[in-house]
Interface confidence: low
């Protein structure tokens, strides 16, 4: 903690400006008014303060707002956000998506820190659920965000938020997570027509049951092999050769290259050889 000392004559800061980078730590403590700092936080980011100087500024804000910073200050924290502990952030009430974006921008390119995790927690708690706009923002900064949540957590995501999910956001999701997300996606996209529906639902199909795959096979969707390989094995096994042929369309030839890998391998073993022969791919059951 910085020792309390009187401000030297003529050094009292009338505003937050570049001259403050020449102040020693004790001078910043003595000569910068905390209320002034709070109202001019937006200027701090433009001034190349040292980490030690930022520590002093944080200390001043902590003294001014012992119960937690107001959102007007939080929104303009900039790099000072990196100085905050999860304990500091737990005192905040962040409700504006603009504030969340501003702080995530500061951490951009870095792994999700405990500070960011706590900030997101506070924000989502304030909103009551992980809504579409929030999910849009979070996945833009952390494409793997959705897949970092447990199935239990994902169950609180409303179907309307699924519109914000991009295919790459699901790249690292495991089958249990897709089991939770797929019914939500099915609900979210239910009013779309066949081809548009398939484009949207495709990335979620790792959670689809057999009956939905059978229904898709009747719609000329031409599923690519990459999507087929991500389907649940237990959902693929009951499909007939004719259904798989319809589901994959022209991509059915790709089964040969994948015949040793699940779920193709397990599916082949469940089929009658004369049914497999109708594909003309030389698949051996």
């Amino acid at each position: 903690e910085v020792e309390k000392t009187a401000c030297p004559s003529g050094k009292k800061a009338p505003e937050i400006d570049e001259s403050l980078i020449f102040y020693k730590k004790w001078e910043l403590e003595a000569c910068v008014d905390a209320a002034l700092l709070a109202t001019q936080m937006d200027r701090v980011n433009a001034i190349p303060f040292t980490y030690e100087q930022l520590d002093v500024l944080k200390h001043k804000l902590d003294e001014l707002y012992p119960q937690g910073y107001p959102e007007s200050v939080i929104q303009h924290l900039g790099y000072l956000f990196l100085k905050m502990s999860p304990e500091d952030i737990r005192k905040w009430n962040v409700t504006s998506l603009e504030t969340l974006k501003a702080l995530l921008e500061v951490n951009k390119g870095h792994e999700m820190s405990p500070q960011v995790a706590t900030l997101i927690d506070r924000f989502v708690k304030g909103r009551g659920q992980l809504d579409k706009d929030t999910l849009d923002t979070l996945t833009a900064f952390y494409p793997g965000y959705l897949c970092s949540l447990s199935p239990e957590e994902l169950s609180s995501v409303p179907p309307s938020s699924i519109w914000a999910v991009r295919p790459q956001d699901l790249d690292t999701c495991d089958p249990r997570q897709l089991d939770v997300l797929y019914p939500k996606a099915r609900l979210a996209f239910q009013n779309m027509n066949g081809s548009e529906y398939f484009v949207k639902i495709q990335s979620f199909l790792g959670g689809a049951p057999t009956e939905d795959l059978k229904a898709l096979s009747q719609q000329n969707v031409s599923m690519d092999l990459a999507t087929f390989m991500k389907l649940r094995t237990d959902a693929v096994l009951p499909l007939t050769v004719a259904e798989v042929q319809k589901l994959l369309g022209p991509h059915v030839e790709g089964l040969k290259a994948e015949e040793r890998h699940r779920p193709v391998r397990d599916w082949i073993l469940r089929q009658r050889q004369d049914d497999l022969d109708t594909l003309g791919l030389g698949l051996q059951g």
Epitope: P86, E87, D121, K125, G126, S148, S156, V157
Partner: antibody, heavy 123, light 112 residues
Framework: QVQLKQSGPGLVQPSQSLSITCTVS????????VHWVRQSPGKGLEWLGV???????DYNAAFISRLSISKDNSKSQVFFKMNSLQADDTAMYYC?????????????????WGQGTSVTVSS | DVVMTQTPLSLPVSLGDQASISCRSS???????????LHWYLQKPGQSPKLLIY???NRFSGVPDRFSGSGSGTDFTLKISRVEAEDLGVYFC?????????FGGGTKLEIK
């Protein structure tokens, strides 16, 4: 599946310290907090403290001077240490997961509990 | 600290009956965000407590729908619509709105 397994001594001498390790599986300590609770016939269930996912701690003021909670995320272990034990600290000590990480509240229920460590303070 | 008072201390019931347990807090459990962090646990003999209901009325995964929670502010109730043998044990209410988190003294559900 989510599990919390506790290891620690059953008998502690008066004025000595108690150390318990809670090893978790099925979830990451980076995402979830862990609480410590004790239960004795005389005082019922008492919340002792918590270590949050970010590593910060909150303690029950009644125990703050002699309680320390820490963790090693990479080993999935949470460490509980209480000093200067007396006979009335005899209890069953539990670790429990804070049922919420990034999108749920940090002030949530304790959704999974360890099997408990029975501690007797006696010479 | 917030004091949690449960009534009754003991609740003798017949299997198939409805059971109701009350929990009262010494101060409001409404958090600054508007959520109320009041939870219910069941502890069977020789076991750790298990979460039944979180945030007043939300059933935890795997908890049968015969369990329901209600209440607001300082007064809360746990109801079991048709008691089964596996429901016997000690029920605790708990608050996590204020630090330190605190628990009720427990209500023992037993066969009449």
């Amino acid at each position: 599946q989510v599990q919390l397994k506790q290891s620690g001594p059953g008998l502690v001498q008066p004025s000595q310290s108690l150390s318990i390790t809670c090893t978790v599986s099925g979830f990451s300590l980076f995402s979830y907090g862990v609480h410590w609770v004790r239960q004795s016939p005389g005082k019922g269930l008492e919340w002792l403290g918590v270590i949050w996912s970010g590593g910060s701690t909150d303690y029950n003021a009644a125990f703050i001077s002699r309680l320390s909670i820490s963790k090693d995320n990479s080993k999935s272990q949470v460490f509980f240490k209480m000093n200067s034990l007396q006979a009335d600290d005899t209890a069953m000590y539990y670790c429990a997961r804070n049922g919420g990480s990034m999108i749920t509240t940090l002030y949530y229920a304790m959704d999974y509990w360890g099997q408990g460590t029975s501690v007797t303070v006696s010479s | 600290d917030v004091v949690m008072t449960q009534t009754p201390l003991s609740l003798p019931v017949s299997l198939g009956d409805q059971a109701s347990i009350s929990c009262r807090s010494s101060q409001s459990l409404v958090h600054s965000y508007g959520n109320t962090y009041l939870h219910w646990y069941l502890q069977k003999p020789g076991q750790s407590p298990k979460l039944l209901i979180y945030k007043v009325s939300n059933r935890f995964s795997g908890v049968p729908d015969r369990f329901s929670g209600s209440g607001s502010g300082t007064d809360f109730t746990l109801k079991i619509s048709r008691v089964e043998a596996e429901d016997l044990g000690v029920y605790f209410c708990s608050q996590s709105t204020h630090i330190p988190f605190t628990f009720g003294g427990g209500t023992k559900l037993e066969i009449k």
